[in-house]
Interface confidence: medium
């Protein structure tokens, strides 16, 4: 297997819920602007999901900039960290299962899943990439686990992978999102894909530091950031080597297998804003 085909899988005891932003500007990267002042400000970091300090130059920049930690938290965080993952003992669905699907106001359409209370099943929809509501899941399995009724009227707990010995067929499996990593490569490899401000639709690649892979995105032709490569190879060469995933206890688990493209996108890919 080549470096490009290697996939790092980690098992952790924590899993981040999909990131849902209250305001799309919370997804902007910290921008100190062109001026040279040294002003302590706060911005929302989509990777750590926390408000953090940065130094602002005093002019220009963007809306992801707040005078105080409290103001930042008020604008960009919501108390969704304690989302309940249902177990077979809890029959109540979370309230958000009853919300209608909401694509939000952005245009970076990605495939997501929502619970349709009318059909009583999880369905696929196109999420615009920002705002929306919590009836929005990265995977069909996660949606089913949380919102669908199991065969006995209980909530489905989780799926295990089962290989049918007769026909080698697969049954659904729940997948975990890697949530802990260290990065020792160029800093721009950590920035989100940035489409830029123009109207072109160029095929480019950016490094997704959450999953340690290069992913395609559409570049507008101008603006954006340095996490923008014309080929997957160039992207991997620049960024892949610096990525190390760790278990919370400090050990590293690596499994090698062929890369498999899936329609399901990782939560952090929702943060770039297309044609807002």
């Amino acid at each position: 297997d080549s470096e490009e085909d290697e996939e790092h899988t980690i098992i952790t005891d924590t899993e981040l819920p999909p990131l849902k932003l209250m305001h799309s500007f919370c997804a902007f990267k910290a921008d100190d602007g062109p001026c040279k002042a040294i002003m302590k400000r706060f911005f929302f970091n989509i990777f750590t999901r926390q408000c953090e300090e940065f130094i602002y130059g005093g002019c220009e920049g963007n809306q992801n900039r707040f005078e105080s930690l409290e103001e930042c938290k008020k604008m960009c965080t919501r108390d969704n960290a304690n989302r309940i993952i249902k177990t077979t003992l809890q029959q109540e669905k979370p309230d958000f299962c009853f919300l209608e699907e909401d694509p939000g106001i952005c245009r970076g359409y990605i495939t997501r899943y929502f619970y349709n209370n009318q059909t009583k099943q999880c369905e696929r929809f196109k999420y615009g990439g920002c705002l929306g509501n919590m009836n929005n899941f990265e995977t069909l399995e996660e949606c089913k686990n949380i919102c669908e009724d199991g065969p006995n009227g209980f909530q489905v707990d989780n799926y295990g992978t089962q290989l049918n010995a007769v026909n080698n067929s697969l049954t659904p499996q729940s997948t975990k999102v890697p949530s802990l990593f260290e990065f020792h490569g160029p800093s721009w490899c950590l920035t989100p894909a940035d489409r830029g401000l123009c109207r072109a639709n160029e095929n480019r690649f950016y490094y997704n530091s959450v999953i340690g892979k290069c992913r395609p995105f559409k570049y507008s032709g101008c603006g954006g950031n340095e996490n923008n490569f014309t080929s997957k190879q160039e992207c991997l060469r620049a960024c892949k080597k610096g990525f190390i995933q760790r278990i919370s206890k400090g050990g590293l688990i690596k499994t090698k297998r062929k890369r498999k493209k899936q329609r399901v996108k990782i939560a952090y890919e929702e943060i770039f804003v297309k044609n807002m």
Epitope: E101, P103, Y109, T111, E123, R124, F125, K126, G128, T139, L140, E141, T161, S169, L170, T171, P172, Q173, T175, P216, K260, K261, Q262, R263
Partner: antibody, heavy 119, light 107 residues
Framework: EVQLVESGGGLVQPGGSLRLSCAAS????????LDWVRQAPGKGLEWVGD????????LYNQKFKGRATISVDQAKNSAYLQMNSLRAEDTAVYYC????????????WGQGTLVTVSS | DIVMTQSHKFMSTSVGDRVSITCKAS??????VAWYQQKPGQSPRLLIY???TRHTGVPDRFTGCGSGTDYTLTISSVQAEDLALYYC?????????FGGGTKLEMK
């Protein structure tokens, strides 16, 4: 060259079952979902459901839920549609189609297999 | 379910004509619309996805446009081989639904 070949169609009694196969070739099977779409004679297209070949996760049109089961066999690069409790209105050409996630559309279709439900 | 309505079941045209086939969704489908061509005895063929992007190998006389609930497939200069059934499909949410089809025929 991408090819999808359906088989298993034919005459079925009302109340009976059928199992259709879709053999895929010419691409990496696990890179794309496979969808089933049907078309009644002289009518339009109707989406039945789809499957992710990597983990077997399925989505169904609610209209067919409970009667339709889509499965996959990675070793054979094949997907299957099992339909139970068939009635006359299930008479149709059943197509399997490759669902390309980057397009969010069905970019290659099989030639279809005709299922006739009649006594 | 989202209903896709193609108001014209048939459209008459001549070679060289410009023709526009319309499709209306029962709710906003956020440009998640595909167009398929189906010739007699054949399976459908993808022409356009995401409302306006041409699939590989599709001649540039085929263009798609639209947003919200209203979408159009235009053939700028109809060729004899374009006489077929045309279906719109929304891929915004499952169940994916198709329009009833518009048959393009010669005058």
């Amino acid at each position: 060259e991408v090819q999808l070949v359906e088989s298993g169609g034919g005459l079925v009694q009302p109340g009976g079952s059928l199992r259709l196969s879709c053999a895929a070739s010419g691409y990496t099977f696990t890179d794309y979902n496979l969808d089933w779409v049907r078309q009644a004679p002289g009518k339009g297209l109707e989406w039945v459901g789809d499957i992710n070949p990597i983990n077997g996760a399925t989505l169904y049109n609610q209209k067919f839920k409970g009667r339709a089961t889509i499965s996959v066999d990675q070793a054979k690069n094949s997907a299957y549609l099992q339909m139970n409790s068939l009635r006359a209105e299930d008479t149709a050409v059943y197509y399997c189609a490759r669902y390309y996630g980057d397009y969010d559309a069905m970019d290659y279709w099989g030639q279809g297999t005709l299922v006739t439900v009649s006594s | 379910d989202i209903v896709m309505t193609q108001s014209h079941k048939f459209m008459s045209t001549s070679v060289g004509d410009r023709v526009s086939i319309t499709c209306k969704a029962s709710q906003d489908v956020h440009t998640a619309v595909a167009w398929y061509q189906q010739k007699p005895g054949q399976s459908p063929r993808l022409l356009i996805y995401w409302a306006s992007t041409r699939h590989t190998g599709v001649p540039d006389r085929f263009t798609g446009c639209g947003s919200g609930t209203d979408y159009t497939l235009t053939i700028s200069s109809v060729q004899a081989e374009d006489l077929a059934l045309y279906y719109c499909q929304q891929h915004y949410t499952t169940p994916y639904t198709f329009g009833g089809g518009t048959k393009l025929e010669m005058k």
